[in-house]
């Protein structure tokens, strides 16, 4: 009679993560007799994923009734794959022996590969905000897919970036990879409502990429343009100037009213207008009693914004001329002369 | 080279039920979903839903939930389109299309299916 | 969901010349465009992906362009056999929107 021969079908086996994964594997004789047992890899670091004779092994079962007398089939399913389970199974048969039973042959093996789903793309952008003109990393992370095959795509709004760089990990074999980008994007005044997205497309996302996104609301920092103006006359002896701030992202804004350097007033922005791109426009009036001065008064408005150093606009009140020959921007000339940065 | 190839004609009364194939050659079946779109006499191409051919899960447009339900057969390369209760404005032509990694459109498409119905 | 408008339903054009169909998304898409070609009584044919890759086989004289919202097909030394519809696809997100085709008429 022909000696057994241990038949494994299949070289390879390619299962999705959480599926099922069945290792066919068949004898061709009933002799000798003894059991069945399936290793992963071979030689003395195997590790065993099922024995037919004994112990517990909760995610395999078996395709046939091994306890039938003329059973052959030999296939074994093993359930909620991971891509740990990824490597070569080895169906071996072995001949009943005393103490121990002794490895007769082996089948020539299935190597199963597991395909897993990239993670969702995770975006981070600078832990601190920047300003327009300046460019900004964002970094995208996904993990635990395989194969190694991916790609990665950044866009801003409806555009394609090109400036980026890209790495999987690890280099060589393993039974998951994971991707990591970082992509360099130029900062506009109009970029509040923009938003930067990573694409991931795998093998395993037959419907549509991964995407993640982030809004570069919470990387910009906007600085405020200020202009300071003198309106008519409200009555004999005071002046009403204001501070219009125009244009600035985020909110958070504090202004100061300076006579002459000597604080007057102080107030944070509430009461704000949004603008089409998000950003942010605010008002500050000061009532001045010219009656009050002697000597010609330099009005400062000096704004906070976003815990930045501030910024500031002067503008000078002449005492000496009447308040109502004032037109609403005598005096306002806001050259450059008048324009202090303090820090 | 790359082909879907779909059944035939049919002719149907309001009420019956249709099953339509789609079968796929040249590929590895399962690397790629399977979408439906339909096209209604004089009207615009509409995307009915998909079917992903690795799990088997299908999506539907809102506009085809209910009456209609997508197959398949996995082992035949095989994917199926079922309307059940078949309405008057169910006559159109039905393709099937390929789609998937790395491009995410709809790269290879069946020949189509023409189903009228009518009493 | 994605509206794809092509404002023309029908252009003429005689042979060798240059035509360029448009197609606007009501929302951003970035550059997830296709166009598909048609010819009476077959079935659409993949002519370019992600707004300016062309299919495979797909001669060089069918050319795309466009990003985010605004997309063109244009096609250079038109030839008989180009009479068909031509319509475009969004592939950013679901459900999947076609827009509603211009018929080419070869004078």
């Known amino acids: 009679e022909e000696e057994l021969q241990v038949i494994q079908p299949d070289k390879s086996v390619l299962v999705a993560a959480g599926e099922t994964a069945t290792l066919r594997c068949t004898a061709t004789s009933l002799i000798p007799v003894g059991p069945i047992q399936w290793f992963r890899g071979a030689g003395p670091g195997r590790e065993l994923i099922y024995n037919q004779k004994e112990g517990h092994f909760p995610r395999v079962t078996t395709v046939s009734d091994l306890t039938k007398r003329n059973n052959m089939d030999f296939s074994i399913r093993i359930g909620n794959i991971t891509p740990a389970d990824a490597g070569t199974y080895y169906c071996v048969k072995f001949r009943k022996g005393s103490p121990d039973d002794v490895e007769f042959k082996s089948g020539a093996g299935t190597e199963l590969s597991v395909r897993a789903k990239p993670s969702a793309p995770v975006v981070s952008g600078p832990a601190a905000r920047a300003t327009p003109q300046h460019t900004v990393s964002f970094t995208c992370e996904s993990h635990g897919f395989s194969p190694r095959d991916i790609t990665l795509k950044w866009f801003k709004n409806g555009n394609e970036l090109s400036d980026f760089q890209t790495n999987v990990d690890p280099v060589g074999e393993s039974v998951s990879y994971s991707i990591h980008s970082t992509a360099k994007v130029v900062l506009t005044r109009e970029d509040v409502h923009s938003q930067v997205i990573c694409e991931v497309a795998h093998v395993t996302l037959q419907g549509d990429p991964l995407r993640g996104t982030a809004n570069l609301s919470e990387t910009i920092r906007v600085p405020p343009t200020l202009e300071v103006t003198q309106q008519p006359v409200r009555a004999e002896n005071q002046v009403n100037v204001t501070c219009q701030v125009r244009k600035f992202y985020p909110q958070r804004l504090q202004l100061t009213w300076l006579e002459n350097g000597n604080v007057s007033r102080t107030e944070t922005a509430s009461t704000v207008t949004e603008n089409k791109d998000g950003t942010y426009n605010w008002m500050s009036w000061l009532l001045v009693n010219v009656s009050a001065h002697r000597d010609d008064v330099k009005l400062t408005c000096q704004v906070e914004h976003d815990g930045q150093p501030a910024v500031s606009k002067s503008h000078d009140l002449k005492v000496s001329a009447h308040p109502k020959e004032q037109g609403s921007n005598t005096a306002a000339e806001n050259t450059g002369s008048n324009e202090r940065n303090i820090y | 080279q790359i082909q879907l190839v779909q059944s035939g004609p049919e002719l149907k009364k309001p009420g019956e039920t249709v099953k339509i194939s789609c079968k796929a050659s040249d590929y590895t079946f399962t690397d790629y979903s399977m979408h439906w779109v339909k096209q209604a006499p004089g009207k615009d191409l509409k995307w009915m839903g998909w079917i992903n051919t690795e799990t088997g899960e299908p999506t539907y447009a809102d506009d085809f939930k209910g009456r209609f339900a997508f197959s398949l057969e996995a082992s035949a390369s095989t994917a199926y389109l079922q309307i059940n209760n078949l309405k008057n404005e169910d006559t159109a032509t039905y393709f099937c299309?390929?789609?998937?990694?790395?491009?995410?459109?709809?790269?290879?498409w069946g020949q189509g299916t023409t189903l009228t119905v009518s009493s | 969901d994605i509206v794809m408008t092509q404002s023309q339903k029908f252009m003429s054009t005689s042979v060798g010349d240059r035509v360029s169909i448009t197609c606007k998304a009501s929302?951003?898409?970035?550059?997830?465009v296709a166009w598909y070609q048609q010819k009476p009584g077959q079935s659409p044919k993949a002519l370019i992906y992600?707004?300016?890759n062309r299919h495979t086989g797909v001669p060089d004289r069918f050319t795309g362009s466009g990003s985010g919202t605004d997309f063109t097909l244009t096609i250079t030394n038109v030839q008989s056999e180009d009479l068909a519809d031509y319509f475009c696809?969004?592939?950013?997100?679901?459900?999947?929107?076609f827009g509603g085709g211009t018929k080419l008429e070869i004078k």
């Open positions: 992600l707004a300016s």
């Open positions: 929302q951003n898409v970035p550059t997830a």
């Open positions: 299309a390929r789609h998937g990694y790395p491009h995410y459109y709809f790269d290879y």
């Open positions: 696809l969004q592939h950013w997100n679901y459900p999947r929107t």
